[in-house]
Interface confidence: low
């Protein structure tokens, strides 16, 4: 469900998740009585959306949504909720929520949930935070302004004409002089690329013509020739002054290693916080809501809302019911147990250092750790056959009657020359194991150690039938290793 | 595969190695989609128009170490996509034995569109450009990039058709490469892996801002199913 993080009018219908006052103080939970006993609570005003500690306007205050604060000296304060961009747009219209559905040239927009006449990958269900409703103009991908696919088969997409808002824009996000996440809020003055090329000024069109201009991206601070990330790239970048190299990323020092952001990021839990740990989880841990944030190898978990060091889709917006708060271990996707993305750039994710609660009151069951080995049975354990067993390579070495098999390389008690390891090097004729080198319809056999019986069949059970292997379902769990 | 890692053996059981019948040299990948059928890239079949020139290796992990689970099957028929798209079907001379190490990938619904930024996986024995793991099956995780974005001048500048899809890390360093052509790009959907792409082409391998390009399998499902029925 798309949660609108903006207000219309006085914001009495606001149901977003802002939970700080305009001065940055955390809100008190509406259901709490400390530090302030509330007049408005979920029990007294059940229809006002008084969930958690989110800013709300249950009393139709003219100044908009507010909350009780966690500061004992300040009973309540107002929140900075931007106006919904319904009639106009701020910045590049990333948060535009209006209903314009015609392009600049007057073409009707194609509905986002339609694949006709233009097939595309902007699937509303996969991008709940982008509000891809009906056929309204939107900007889900860092364009200069909202656009849509058109209903004209000859024109795949086109920009829409959305007027700019004239009221003051929403307060900017905290900005940094160092690299945080993808660097969309980087406002430093680095102006050379990773290979040492000087950046082209954003306002100029030589040597490279482009549309990443200060006019098109008014809120992205495209000043001078400083490296920026106006369009959702993976890191700050710039066009270069080398006509042979259109653009390149920049080397920006990480905020992790430098302590000089303009403002600290309030979404990251403070390091000194020592949360209470719920020591175990039930079943596969989808209901686990503890505060453990350490993996099985001792790594710290990455915040679910963060995209650094690992970009991912398991965000609180995409999985609103999965409890993806802070950087706590969770299981949003039905895995074996709670896990998290790690803060180690070389290890994308790991299971967490948690035990499964005993559901029968017995001993605690350890969650299996992530193994780099295949989880399917090893060859030595696979003592079953497919079809007629021509490919059987198990270790059964007695006949169905219980007689031990003669070794394939041996010539006692039976001399033979047709089925030997030399004549059939690919038939797996090792030791005295049952085999089917000739594709006998009755299955694997061996020469027997009974001098009166040259050969006999072995009793090898059939493996789960081929039909039990469904397409697209490996029997060995893939590693799913991240990129590099 | 450049970047990524060595796969768990047999964890991508639909991956096949397409080889010349006489030298046994691996030159392309492919995907088992039914016991008798392999999907690959049409450009992998430029060496010869005769099916007897090729053989298919299934159930392998090491490129040149013959495991006990390996099946080797000759090719009975080559079927190229009629509109010159880079996709082709190989009919095997006999059905592969479906085991825990040889399992087909699922085909997508016709015309299904993979959502932008969906995480998918490529596999192959292709060029690693010194990134470790040569000779063993490698895998890498890549996000799909919407054609609208991929065709920006900064990336592939209008080269990508609607019958193709892009996937890659824009920062570079991870990609399919020579020898991976014809192999699978699979995406996990609900409870299984679905073949969404056939490795086709790229501007170099693993270069920043140059994602790999894959044939969009969903656009050819009707053709694939028709050919499998008729043959």
């Amino acid at each position: 469900v798309y949660l609108s993080e903006c207000k219309t009018g006085i914001g009495n219908g606001y149901r977003g998740t802002m939970s700080r006052t305009k001065s940055g103080v955390a809100c008190q939970k509406w259901g709490a009585t400390f530090p302030h006993v509330p007049n408005y609570s979920p029990s007294t005003h059940p229809n006002e959306g008084l969930e958690e500690n989110y800013c709300r306007n249950p009393d139709n205050d003219e100044q908009g949504p507010w909350c009780y604060t966690t500061d004992p000296d300040k009973r309540y304060d107002y929140c900075n909720i931007p106006e919904c961009e319904e009639e106009c747009m701020y910045c590049s219209g990333e948060k535009y929520e209006g209903k314009i559905s015609k392009t600049m040239s007057g073409l009707d927009c194609q509905a986002w949930d339609s694949q006709s006449p233009h097939a595309h990958g902007y699937i509303p269900a996969k991008f709940p935070s982008k509000n891809l409703k009906m056929n309204y103009c939107r900007n889900p991908d860092g364009e200069p302004r909202p656009w849509c696919f058109t209903t004209d088969p000859t024109k795949r997409w086109e920009y829409c004409d959305i007027p700019r808002c004239t009221t003051p824009p929403p307060p900017p996000s905290p900005t940094y002089q160092c690299l945080k996440g993808r660097g969309e809020n980087y406002r430093g003055t680095v102006s050379v690329t990773v290979s040492g090329k000087t950046c082209q000024r954003w306002s100029e069109q030589t040597p490279h013509r482009h549309n990443r201009t200060p006019e098109n991206f008014p809120c992205k601070n495209l000043e001078e020739n400083y490296c920026r990330n106006p369009d959702g790239e993976t890191a700050p970048w710039c066009y270069t002054t080398d006509s042979q190299l259109r653009w390149e990323y920049c080397e920006i020092p990480s905020c992790e290693s430098s302590a000089s952001p303009d403002q600290s990021d309030s979404s990251v839990p403070p390091e000194e916080q020592t949360p209470v740990v719920q020591e175990c989880y039930q079943s596969d841990g989808q209901s686990y809501r503890g505060t453990s944030s350490t993996t099985i190898t001792g790594k710290k978990c990455q915040s679910w809302a963060a995209m650094f060091p690992h970009r991912h889709s398991k965000t609180p917006e995409n999985f609103p019911d999965a409890g993806l708060e802070m950087n706590y271990c969770r299981n949003p996707d039905g895995d074996k147990g709670p896990w998290c993305y790690t803060t180690d750039p070389s290890v994308r994710w790991e299971y967490c250092n948690l035990k499964r609660c005993s559901e029968t009151g017995g001993s605690v069951v350890e969650l299996p750790t992530v193994s780099q080995e295949p989880s399917g049975p090893s060859d030595s354990e696979t003592d079953c056959m497919y079809g007629n067993g021509k490919d059987y390579r198990g270790k059964t070495a007695v006949t169905a009657a219980g007689t031990p098999c003669q070794g394939w390389a041996a010539q006692e008690p039976h001399r033979h020359s047709i089925f030997t390891p030399q004549t059939n090097p690919r038939a797996g004729l090792e030791k005295n194991y049952c085999r089917n080198p000739d594709g006998d319809v009755n299955g694997p056999w061996c020469y027997t150690t009974n001098p009166r019986k040259l050969y006999d069949y072995c009793d090898i059970p059939l493996c789960a039938s081929a039909s039990s292997f469904e397409c697209g379902k490996p029997q060995v769990e893939p590693k799913k290793c991240p990129g590099r | 595969v450049v970047g990524g890692c060595v796969a768990n053996p047999h964890s991508w059981p639909w991956q096949i190695s397409l080889r010349t019948r006489f030298t046994g040299q691996h030159f392309c990948g492919g995907t088992l989609i039914a016991p008798e059928w392999v999907l690959t890239a049409a450009h992998c079949l430029e060496k010869s128009s005769r099916p007897e020139f090729y053989k298919v290796i299934l159930g392998a992990h090491e490129e040149y170490i013959r495991g006990l689970d390996v099946q080797e099957i000759s090719v009975a028929k080559l079927i190229l996509e009629p509109n010159n798209r880079d996709i082709a079907l190989l009919k095997l001379s006999r059905p592969a034995t479906i085991t825990d190490k040889v399992i087909p990938a699922c085909l997508p619904s016709p015309n299904y569109m993979v959502a932008d930024r969906t995480i998918c996986y490529i596999t192959g024995w292709g060029e690693t450009q010194g990134t470790f793991g040569a000779g063993r099956l490698k895998e890498a995780q890549l996000p799909v990039i919407e054609n609208k974005v991929c065709n920006r001048v900064e990336y592939l500048n209008n080269r990508v058709k609607s019958t193709e899809l892009c996937a890659g890390q824009l920062a570079g360093g991870v990609d399919s490469c020579q020898g991976d052509s014809g192999g699978p790009l699979v995406c996990f959907e609900k409870d299984k892996y679905i073949l969404q792409g056939v490795t086709s082409w790229g501007l170099g391998c693993a270069r920043p801002n140059k994602p790999g390009v894959y044939v969009r399998v969903s656009r050819f499902v009707d053709w694939i199913e028709r050919e499998m029925r008729n043959n």
Epitope: R156 | R152, V153, N157
Partner: nanobody, 124 residues
Framework: QVQLVETGGGLVQAGGSLRLSCAAS????????MDWYRQAPGKERELVAA???????NYADSVKGRFTISRDNAKDTVYLQMNSLKPEDAAFYYC??????????????????WGQGTQVTVSS
Amino acid sequence: QVQLVETGGGLVQAGGSLRLSCAASGNIFSINAMDWYRQAPGKERELVAAITSGGTTNYADSVKGRFTISRDNAKDTVYLQMNSLKPEDAAFYYCNADGYYSDYDKNLAEFNSWGQGTQVTVSS
């Protein structure tokens, strides 16, 4: 690619007026600058007037105060209003535009296109 078609040329008396139009067509993503050039027989092609997508204009000294360039972004069209025409204004007038065009998909492939030209004759 992108095609430009100029219209509005013709024969006019000195002191008279003409309005030239240039319409761009094709899978246009955006147009940056649209310019009018002219070329008289035996002379170099010269820039007469230019206009950016934001509406900033530029004129050759010889036409300042007499010619006005304007554009309709929604129609991808540029106009040149020519007043107080002089015999030395007679020439072939060409439209030039640059920007980005689109083919199968969104694409910022750059274009720089010229029209075929329209003839302006000024009699004295």
